[in-house]
């Protein structure tokens, strides 16, 4: 339906409130690098422009899309030039050309130092002094950190976030009551941002058919009693949500995703038993709590698929005139009897009755070509179980940081060209699979753990191809999404690498060690063994096992001696000479 | 298997209406096509209404607009409500069904029928 005024349209349904922060959002993840005070001036000017498009749709300027009036005020700022360098060339593009060179200049690895949290008392006075300025600068600050961040998700964030300060800041031990609170926040957030950031580099990379075929899996899990032709009104209204928000379109992107809200919650009944709860809630919460809700049971007696997909005349008929339609059809019903399974195995396990069907619909006997074709589906099966449960068993054995270290080796290993930073974030997030998976029953495992590992090689692939440096990376990254993962576990050690030249620079430490927290002291120390890879990638684990354990006595000797800074100095050359002979 | 039952059928006088019934079992056939054929006596089976999986319908010309088809999945069943009726709708009428994503035409695309259930239009 179209309206006079975009603009007007999306404040009158979203609300001042919310309006004013999806904008912020949007500024702050498209300019990452804007002092605060530039943006919340920006978004002061929009809101009354929008407030007078309200009163009167037919005012000057009221009719031009939402993309033409925020690049037009992107395009005021006046360092952009200088701030952005080529990214203000944007700014002579017409719409929509202009829009897709500021999605094409997000940056995912900003050069923004890191969030340092103050005193609880200086966060608690800053809190009640300008409560909303206080939320703004949280909207900004994880926005221009998080260029993809799901925008309607952040609003709910930044509802949490104020209601942990409302009631911390009031009790009698506020850094005990929101220390916790802001860590869950943190970790949530970054949880989120990476989920959100599969979901972009899903529609941008792969199109809209790879965020389908992810999103008829996902919801038929969740919601196996629902029909087929259900589950794809809610992919096709999931789907539209989220190229919105991938494609900055934040005020649309909220907009349809509290119509979703709405539709499921009106229509409960023919779509799960469980979400009943969530609809009970205020809108944000609603959203998120649709988004997160569990599996609903399975129906008792679904009949075996063979004989409607393998076994019936019309396969080929079916897949020859709906092809798209069919597939989805059958992931559906692979899907909602298969919660046990991993979206990515499902999606692989479709892939493989296509690519069955696309041969043998194409032969002499197609029945007699594709009767076997689910016992194909065999291996793909065992594959990621087999592999869950190997990593479950040394995640259990080691213990996390031990095998966060042990993963650290392994893709140093596979590809040891990227750079040490991103081996060391991606394999630390990696070995948190461990604790946030083995621990379930079976049937929860590879979910979890395919899922999970997905969302973290995709910071891989998105940190990588802002600077490509292994040929073997972008082949895992660009070929097939549903084969990142497999693709990955498949490399070996990388052959044709030239080890890295010895710089007794990278091994030298200093008393600052000692004052670092435990994990800051562990990414000290993973760099560190990752750098030893690179330098003897042929190093065997017990080589480098011995070499870490010396490093953890040398500084924890050190950390405990009068004079920490002459300790590093004097015991850290002999460290590097002893790791170096341990190595030769 | 899908065992179809019809219901509904009787006499009824020209311009009045009637509700016919296809009840489904054996497995859910919400993703299945379903269809409306009837026979007259002495006359070949022919294509009343269609429905797919998405409860997009199609009609032979000669019912369009007097008769409706419909499904209740929940209730694994399927319904063609006939009004404004003549005497030439006058015919024993088959519910089948198939796992075909569109809906079919042709009585030998569907492999599951019916017993059928007679309509009389007479006064």
């Known amino acids: 339906d179209t309206h006079k005024s975009e603009v007007a349209h999306r404040f009158k349904d979203l609300g001042e409130e919310h309006f004013k922060g999806l904008v912020l959002v949007a500024f702050s993840q498209y300019l990452q690098q804007c002092p605060f005070e530039e943006h919340v001036k920006l978004v002061n000017e929009v809101t009354e422009f929008a407030k007078t498009c309200v009163a009167d749709e037919s005012a000057e300027n009221c009719d031009k899309s939402l993309h033409t009036l925020f690049g037009d005020k992107l395009c005021t700022v006046a360092t952009l030039r200088e701030t952005y360098g080529e990214m203000a060339d944007c700014c002579a593009k017409q719409e929509p050309e202009r829009n897709e060179c500021f999605l094409q200049h997000k940056d995912d690895n900003p050069n923004l130092p890191p969030l340092v949290r103050p005193e609880v008392d200086v966060m608690c006075t800053a809190f009640h002094d300008n409560e909303a300025t206080f939320l703004k600068k949280y909207l900004y600050e994880v926005a221009r950190r998080h260029p993809y961040f799901y925008a309607p998700e952040l609003l709910f964030f930044a509802a949490r976030y104020k209601a942990a300060f409302a009631e911390c800041c009031q009790a009698a031990d506020k850094a005990a009551c929101l220390l916790p609170k802001l860590d869950e926040l943190r970790d949530e957030g970054k949880a989120s941002s990476a989920k959100q950031r599969l979901k972009c580099a899903s529609l941008q990379k792969f199109g809209d058919r790879a965020f389908k075929a992810w999103a008829v899996a996902r919801l038929s899990q969740k919601f196996p009693k629902a029909e087929f032709a259900e589950v794809s009104k809610l992919v096709t209204d999931l789907t539209k949500v989220h190229t919105e928000c991938c494609h900055g379109d934040l005020l649309e992107c909220a907009d349809d995703r509290a119509d979703l809200a709405k539709y499921m919650c009106e229509n409960q009944d023919s779509i799960s038993s469980k979400l009943k709860e969530c609809c009970d809630k205020p809108l944000l919460e609603k959203s998120h709590c649709l988004a997160e809700v569990e599996n609903d049971e399975m129906p008792a007696d679904l009949p075996s698929l063979a004989a409607d997909y393998v076994e019936s005349k019309d396969v080929c008929k079916n897949y020859a005139e709906a092809k798209d339609v069919f597939l989805g059809m059958f992931l559906y019903e692979y899907a909602r009897r298969h919660p046990d399974y991993s979206v990515m195995l499902l999606l692989r396990l479709a892939k493989a009755y296509e690519a069955t069907l696309e041969k043998c619909c194409a032969a002499a006997d197609p029945h007699e070509c594709y009767a076997k074709v689910f016992d194909e589906f065999q291996p793909l099966v065992e594959e990621p179980q087999n592999l869950v449960k190997q990593n479950c068993e040394l995640f259990e054995q080691l213990g996390e940081y031990k095998f966060q270290n042990a993963l650290l080796v392994r893709y140093t290993k596979k590809v040891p060209q990227v750079s040490t930073p991103t081996l060391v974030e991606v394999s630390r997030n990696l070995g948190k699979v461990g604790a946030k998976c083995c621990k379930l029953p079976e049937a929860k495992r590879m979910p979890c753990a395919e899922d999970y590992l997905s969302v973290v090689l995709n910071r891989l692939c998105v940190l990588h191809e802002k600077t490509p440096v292994s040929e073997k990376v972008t082949k895992c990254c660009t070929e097939s999404l549903v084969n990142r993962r497999p693709c990955f576990s498949a490399l070996e050690l990388d052959e044709a690498y030239v080890p890295k030249a010895f710089n007794a620079e990278t091994f030298t430490f200093h008393a600052d060690m000692c004052t670092l927290s435990e994990k800051e002291k562990q990414v000290k120390k993973q760099t560190a063994l990752v750098e030893l890879v690179k330098h003897k990638p042929k190093a065997t684990k017990e080589q480098l096992k011995g070499v870490m354990d010396n490093f953890a006595a040398f500084v924890e000797k050190c950390c405990k001696a009068d004079d920490k800074e002459a300790c590093f100095a004097e015991e850290g050359p002999k460290f590097v000479a002893a790791s170096q002979a341990a190595l030769a | 298997q899908v065992q179809l039952v019809e219901s509904g059928g009787g006499l009824v006088k020209p311009g009045g209406s009637l509700r016919l019934s296809c009840a489904a079992s054996?497995?859910?056939?919400?993703?299945?096509?379903a269809a409306w054929f009837r026979q007259a006596p002495g006359k070949e089976r022919e294509f009343v209404s269609a429905?797919?999986?998405?409860?997009?319908?199609t009609y032979a010309d000669s019912v369009k607009g007097r008769f409706t088809i419909s499904r209740d999945n929940a209730k694994n069943s399927l319904y063609l409500q006939m009004n404004s009726l003549r005497a030439e709708d006058t015919a024993v009428y088959y519910c089948?069904?198939?796992?075909?994503?569109?809906?079919?035409?042709?009585?030998?695309?569907?492999?599951?029928w019916g017993q059928g259930t007679l309509v009389t239009v007479s006064s």
């Open positions: 089948a069904a198939v796992f075909r994503v569109v809906a079919p035409k042709t009585q030998y695309d569907y492999d599951y």
């Open positions: 429905i797919n999986w998405q409860k997009t319908a």
């Open positions: 054996g497995r859910p056939v919400s993703n299945y096509a």
